[in-house]
């Protein structure tokens, strides 16, 4: 194929690939009709003047994962057709001025994963057609004003994984076509007002893993097309009331790993397209009414690993499309019976690792599509009669690591678990905590003939029970179950019963990655 160097492979499609540690210089002669050239994993340390002079038809040039530390300014001369240039994963510390001069067709320039210490306006002044510029994974400490002023067609700019401590409010002002801006994993402590005002077409803004403490109230007000906003793992302690007010297209917002203490009603929205909201690993202590009410299309709400001890009954108002709600690893002791009433489409709720002592009988009354409930590691001693009976799609229920009180009142829960086991997978069985003589024994094989009578009257469910059984299509009113009768009846039925005998001590620990944050 018009002469292929011995160190390379050349294909019919004018593609040349040169790889291997034995290569220490750009191989020659390269086929004059080459359109794609890849020089990968070699020991080339420098590019001298015009090594590609005779392959002017080249469209894509990848020089990646080499030892490249020095480039002569004229290295890319005569590559006027070049559209894609990658120098990623090398050891470049300095870019010579004029290096990209003459690359009039260049659309993608990848300089990521080098050791670049600075960039200057003159570096990219000739790259007027550039659409993608990758500078992530370098050692940049600041971006001078004007660095990107000539890149008016740029749609993607990645400055992540550098050492940026501040950003000039003017540095992005001419990038009106930018769709993706990534500034993640830097050392930014604040972002000046107006920094993003010129980015009217921005769709993704990645600011995660910085040290941002405050967000200016109008920081995103000009970014009406923003779809993805990543603010996780910063030091944000409060959200200005209007900070998210002008983001009607937003469908992904991450705020996990910050220092948020409270969420004020209406802080989110209106965001009619937001599908996921990640708020885990903050310091939130309560959720007021209507805090998420603008998020009509929200499907995933992650509030785990906070310090939530109180949830107002109307906190989840408006979340009619929510599928997954994660509240695990908080400080919840009680839940209002109506708190989940609006979540008609909820499929997965994680409440594990809280301090829940009891659940209202109607807590899941309107959430008929629930498929998974995680209640492990709370302070539950029993559950109200019929609490799961209407949940015909339930296929995962985790109840282990609670201090179950195995007196006669536990029988309905024990029966439900036994009769529904094929729907509940093979997870860990709940274990009795009291009375003391049965501590550590499996709840579902207690000897019911010697069950301890209860010494209290449990809470009576506040809703009529219509247990879910696949073979029973409906129940006439005359046979509906009244929970009051058996729960408040005296204990004479148990006069011959003294203690619970349980002989099974097996415990299998099971975890899923669902709701792990």
């Amino acid at each position: 194929y018009h002469g292929c160097p011995s160190e390379c492979t050349c294909s019919r499609a004018s593609q040349v690939e040169c790889t291997g540690a034995r290569i220490v210089a750009v191989p020659t002669p390269l086929p004059w009709n080459a359109m794609s050239l890849q020089i990968l994993n070699t020991h080339i340390t420098e590019l001298n003047e015009s090594p590609f002079l005779n392959i002017s038809a080249l469209i894509a040039l990848r020089i990646e994962k080499n030892e490249l530390s020095r480039i002569t300014p004229g290295a890319f001369r005569n590559l006027g057709s070049l559209r894609y240039l990658s120098l990623a994963n090398n050891k470049l510390q300095v870019l010579p001025i004029g290096l990209f001069q003459g690359l009039d067709s260049l659309e993608s320039l990848l300089l990521s994963s080098n050791q670049l210490l600075q960039i200057q306006p003159a570096h990219f002044s000739q790259c007027s057609n550039l659409k993608e510029l990758q500078l992530h994974g370098n050692h940049l400490e600041y971006i001078p004003d004007g660095a990107f002023d000539h890149l008016v067609g740029l749609t993607k700019l990645n400055l992540g994984k550098n050492s940026l401590t501040h950003i000039s409010p003017r540095v992005f002002q001419h990038l009106g076509n930018l769709q993706v801006l990534r500034l993640y994993e830097n050392r930014l402590t604040d972002i000046p007002m107006g920094t993003f005002d010129g980015l009217v077409n921005l769709q993704e803004l990645a600011l995660q893993q910085n040290q941002i403490g405050l967000l200016s109230p109008g920081l995103f007000h000009n970014n009406h097309n923003l779809q993805r906003l990543y603010l996780s793992n910063n030091h944000i302690s409060q959200l200005p009331p209007s900070v998210f007010m002008q983001l009607p297209q937003l469908n992904r917002l991450t705020l996990f790993g910050n220092s948020l203490k409270e969420l004020s009603p209406g802080i989110f929205g209106p965001m009619p397209n937001l599908r996921e909201l990640w708020l885990y690993d903050n310091h939130i202590s309560s959720l007021p009414d209507n805090v998420f009410s603008n998020l009509r299309q929200l499907q995933v709400l992650i509030l785990s690993r906070n310090q939530i001890s109180f949830i107002s009954p109307g906190a989840f108002n408006g979340l009619t499309e929510l599928r997954e709600l994660s509240l695990h690893t908080n400080a919840l002791q009680d839940l209002d019976g109506n708190v989940f009433r609006m979540l008609a489409n909820l499929q997965n709720i994680s409440l594990q690792n809280n301090r829940l002592r009891q659940l209202p009988g109607n807590i899941f009354a309107n959430v008929n599509g629930l498929m998974a409930i995680q209640l492990q590691n709370n302070q539950l001693e029993n559950l109200p009669l019929g609490i799961f009976d209407h949940l015909g799609k339930l296929c995962e229920l985790r109840l282990y690591d609670n201090p179950w009180r195995c007196d006669s009142d536990i029988l309905p829960l024990r029966n439900w678990l036994l009769l529904n086991q094929p729907r509940l997978g093979t997870d860990t069985v709940p274990v009795c905590f009291s009375p003391a003589n049965v501590r550590g024994q499996s709840l579902i094989i207690i000897n019911v003939n010697v069950a301890v009578p209860s010494v209290h009257v449990p809470e009576v469910p506040s809703y009529p029970e219509t247990p879910w059984y696949p073979d029973t299509p409906s129940y006439p009113d005359t046979t509906s179950v009244s929970s009051t009768t058996e729960l408040t009846s005296p204990v004479e039925d148990y006069t011959d019963l003294t203690t619970i005998q349980v002989t099974d001590d097996r415990s299998v620990w099971g975890m899923t990655q669902a709701q792990s944050g």
Epitope: N415, Q421, P467, Y475
Partner: antibody, heavy 113, light 111 residues
């Protein structure tokens, strides 16, 4: 003392229905499942279904022919089997709890023309 | 349906000797780390009586000479020292999933 007392023997013609009762005492009626099991003469045991708090579950072999009901006021469970045929001749037992820990004395149903 | 196969069909054992009855399920009857295998004793003209539930747990009032073992698909009922009153038919049963199914029975007699 837990007891399950069943109704007396029945003789039925093919195509007819039979309704067997099982009266429970000595425990909280609503806290336990009641199963029905039958045993043809000289044969093994066959589970028919259970009832618990008005909810029922049936063996597919009996679905549509067997109906389980209960009357909480009298702590009584009923098993009705319709469209009887000669092979339904058997002793029918009720049994308490998931683990069948107490059984009724059995009711012989004879189907003969 | 889960099919339960008992062996042997009948067993003659001397008084005071050990009697062992096996039961195999067509698929595992384990859940939650517990085996949902139960054993019943039926004497002529009487209803069955629960001996062992969940593979190894004795029913109320069952003598200590009756024990159960096994997991997964293979289970054993052992009568450590056969007594005259143990002459009966013994049934295994799985309660892992509906329909709950019984083995065909093993008749135990005195040799």
């Amino acid at each position: 003392q837990v007891q399950l007392v069943q109704s007396g023997a029945e003789v039925k013609k093919p195509g007819a229905s039979v309704k067997v009762s099982c009266k429970a005492s000595g425990y909280t009626f609503t806290s336990f499942v009641i199963h029905w099991v039958r045993q043809a003469p000289g044969q093994g045991l066959e589970w028919m279904g259970y009832i618990y708090n008005q909810g029922t579950k049936y063996n597919e072999r009996f679905r549509g022919r067997a109906t389980l009901t209960s009357d909480k006021s009298t702590s009584t469970v009923y098993m009705e089997l319709s469209s009887l045929r000669s092979e339904d001749t058997a002793v029918y037992y009720c049994a308490r709890d998931y683990y069948f820990d107490y059984w009724g004395q059995g009711t012989l149903v004879t189907v003969s023309s | 349906d889960i099919v339960m196969t008992q062996s042997p069909d009948s067993l003659a054992v001397s008084l005071g000797e050990r009697a062992t009855i096996n039961c195999r399920a067509s698929e595992s009857v384990d859940y939650y780390g517990i085996s949902f295998m139960n054993w019943y004793q039926q004497k002529p003209g009487q209803p069955p009586k629960l001996l062992i539930y969940a593979a190894s747990n004795q029913g109320s009032g069952v003598p200590d000479r009756f024990s159960g073992s096994g997991s997964g698909t293979d289970f054993t009922l052992t009568i450590s020292s056969l007594q005259a009153e143990d002459v009966a038919v013994y049934y295994c049963q799985q309660s892992k999933e509906v329909p709950y199914t019984f083995g065909g029975g093993t008749k135990v007699e005195i040799k």
